[in-house]
Structures are given as structure tokens and as C-alpha cells.
């Protein structure tokens, strides 16, 4: 029962992670313009994402522009896009694998195979978490590096956007959920069936036998 509870918690966490990852990838808030200096009132804020950039005026009006050419984009942005999409697809694959092996489904009947599928889904979710973490950490590193680089002018300096925090949360949830799914499975492949057998034999009705008829190997 505890194992089933952990599985449900694990998959709920990974689903939350997947949604967070999707929002993180989609929102144009990876980089936010950093206006340094206390003597000025900034008229606009620029948000930059993987797919578009947005300008928010002081009036609250927002204008977004989707990046035109794929080939004209910086390589790190192209890589971040690719990793984000791959991470989301990998997590979806992990979910399908989990559903095939979940205790409450009948796709696979054999308990050993079910356990292996849940374990596999956990590993897949962990991989998805790592794939989500790479572009987020890479972008954060680039922002921080440029922020403290004396060669970079203020207009080119950026701050960490909300999408990065969502990305970290998504990665954490996928890693945690995947880890929980890995932990719900028995460590040895053959332990599962013998565990069920032991439970079955203890609950079987006792038959009166002579003392010599009891198999001695059952006693430790």
C-alpha cells in the first residue's frame, strides 16, 4: 500500500514538473532587462524567451515579437530550444511507460514486468529532469557571467527571468518524482514474485501432519 502511495506521489510530482517545464519553455521570461542605476526611471522592460521577446511599456502595454529566422538565432538559444522540447517529449514517454506498468492498469499483467516498467519510467523522468536542468543552468550562467563582465554594456546586461525559476522547479519535481518511482520498485528483479509467494503460503490453511512431514527447510 505504501508502495502504491509513493508511486502516485511520484507520478503527481512528475506531472507537475512536466507542466512547469512546459510553461517555462513557452513563457518569454528567460531573460529580463537589467536597468542598473538609481537615478533613472525606466520606461520599458524587455523580456526574452526561447521563442519570442516582449517589450512591456510603463503604461502596461505589451508587444511581443516571435523570432524570425531559426538559423539566425544564437547557437545556445537553438540548443536550449531543442533540449526543452526533448525534455518535454522524454517526460511524456516516461508517463506512457509508467501508465503501462502502473498497479492500477492492465496493459501488463505480470507483476515483475510492471515493476520493471515503473522503474524504467522513473529513470526516464530523471533523464527528463536533467535535460530540463541543462538549458536553464546554461542560460543562468550566461546571464550571471555577462552581468559581472565589465566589457558588457548596461543595455546588454540581463537578469534571471521567471522562466528560469520555473525551469529549476520543473527539473526538481521531475528528478524527485522520478526518484520516488525508482524507489517504489524492489531492488532485485526476482524478489517480487517470491515476495508474493511468501505472503500466499503464510495465509494458506494449515493441514494436520505428523511432525516429520513438515519440510524442515521452512524453518530458520
Amino acid at each position: 500500500m505504501a508502495s502504491a502511495g509513493m508511486q502516485i506521489l511520484g507520478v503527481v510530482l512528475t506531472l507537475l514538473g512536466w507542466v512547469n517545464g512546459l510553461v517555462s519553455c513557452a513563457l518569454p521570461m528567460w531573460k529580463v532587462t537589467a536597468f542598473i542605476g538609481n537615478s533613472i526611471v525606466v520606461a520599458q522592460v524587455v523580456w526574452e524567451g526561447l521563442w519570442m521577446s516582449c517589450v512591456v511599456q510603463s503604461t502596461g502595454q505589451m508587444q511581443c515579437k516571435v523570432y524570425d529566422s531559426l538559423l539566425a538565432l544564437p547557437q545556445d538559444l537553438q540548443a536550449a530550444r531543442a533540449l526543452c522540447v526533448i525534455a518535454l517529449l522524454v517526460a511524456l514517454f516516461g508517463l506512457l511507460v509508467y501508465l503501462a506498468g502502473a498497479k492500477c492498469t492492465t496493459c501488463v499483467e505480470e507483476k515483475d514486468s510492471k515493476a520493471r516498467l515503473v522503474l524504467t519510467s522513473g529513470i526516464v523522468f530523471v533523464i527528463s529532469g536533467v535535460l530540463t536542468l541543462i538549458p536553464v543552468c546554461w542560460t543562468a550562467h550566461a546571464i550571471i557571467r555577462d552581468f559581472y563582465n565589465p566589457l558588457v554594456a548596461e543595455a546588454q546586461k540581463r537578469e534571471l527571468g521567471a522562466s528560469l525559476y520555473l525551469g529549476w522547479a520543473a527539473s526538481g519535481l521531475l528528478l524527485l518524482g522520478g526518484g520516488l518511482l525508482c524507489c517504489t520498485c524492489p531492488s532485485g528483479g526476482s524478489q517480487g514474485p517470491s515476495h508474493y509467494m511468501a505472503r500466499y503460503s503464510t495465509s494458506a490453511p494449515a493441514i494436520s501432519r505428523g511432525p516429520s512431514e513438515y519440510p524442515t527447510k521452512n524453518y530458520v
Epitope: G37, S39, I40, V42, A43, P150, L151, A153, E154, A155
Partner: antibody
Amino acid sequence: EVQLQESRPELVKPGASVKISCKTSGYTFTEYTLHWVKQSHGKSLEWIGGINPNNGDTIYNQKFKGKATLTVDKSSSTAYMELRSLTSEYSAVYYCARRAITVYAMDYWGQGTSVTVSS
Amino acid sequence: DIQMTQSSSSFSVSLGDRVTITCKASEDIYNRLAWYQQKPGNAPRLLISGATSLETGTPSRFSGSGSGKDYTLSITSLRTEDAATYYCQQYWSTPLTFGTGTKLELK
């Protein structure tokens, strides 16, 4: 006293390369970025690029990318700018300048090196 | 790139005059502006940064003002040593760009 001492004037043939030096003194070399500025005769100033002597990081004006290469020698507190495949439009005075610590303006300048490209 | 325009390329001025040199940026540079003085045969010298802050050694007769795209350098009671070319420079964005220059000549 902060000083930036640039190398002697250069007369080079078209297509050739030139390497200008800028020897600094009077401050900690690695604490300030160094920049190069071009001034053609009777014209305005043009920023070429800058270098961080601490780690060798560079930034270039797109116009001079592939034309200018900025380097430093920390042991001698000297900055260098190499200009290659020169044409007559690169005949100018080249200044090295130190970036001010709080703003991206140049607070100390070298005396300038005159480069003449002529056959 | 941000273009910096100094509308007057030269001024003919008299000693004691008050002079105002203007500089216009092609976009908002948020006060990230410096003014330089250059005398013939010499390197430029930084006078003002942050649009208004006088550098150490800059005489108090010099002052800077402006915001957004428009900035000015003012010199009250002009002196002989002020005859030079003045350049503005934006450092809001790279590439750093300089104004076209304004030459002050004494009458």
C-alpha cells in the same frame, strides 16, 4: 600617476599587418578593461573594441571583427592591437584608453599611434 | 547601433561667452553619456560622465544636463584653454559610439 604609453608611428604597405602596443603604469593592470579607439584625420572617434586583462575576454565593434585582434601581456602590463590586411581607410591615429571603474567611459588615454597605409 | 549627433560642427566664440553644445542620441540612452575635450595633436580627455557628473580636474565652469535622447554640455565664461573639439559618447550599449564632434574656435 596613471600612464598609457603607445608605440611609435607606423608606415605599412597595403595588405600588410601592424601590431600596436600600449604599455600601462601607475595602476593595477588587471583591474581595468582597456579599449582601442580609431580617429581618422579630421574625423570623429570610432570604438574598435576592448579587452579584460584579467582573463583575456574581448569585445569588438562588429565593423572591426576579423580586422582587429586585441591581446594583453600581464607580465609587462601591456595591451596590443593587431590590424591585418590593411587598406588606406585604416590610415588613422589609434588610441588605447582605460575604462573608468564605475562607468563605461574612458578616463585615461594613450598619446595615440599614427598608422599610415601607403605603397 | 546608437547614432550620436552633434548638430553644430563648429562654433566661433568670444572669451567670456556662455556656450551650449548639444548631442542627440538615436534612442534613449538613460543618462549613460560622457563628454570629452580634444585639443589638436592630443588625446581626448574625459570631462563629464553620467551626463552630469564632473570628473576630477574638470573646471566648475563646465556642466552637463539632459535625459532620454537629448543632452547638452555648457561652458560658462569661456576661457582661451577651452578652444578645442568636444565629443559626446554613449555607453548605454555596445558598440560604444561617439558624436560627430563640435569645434570651438575663438573669434
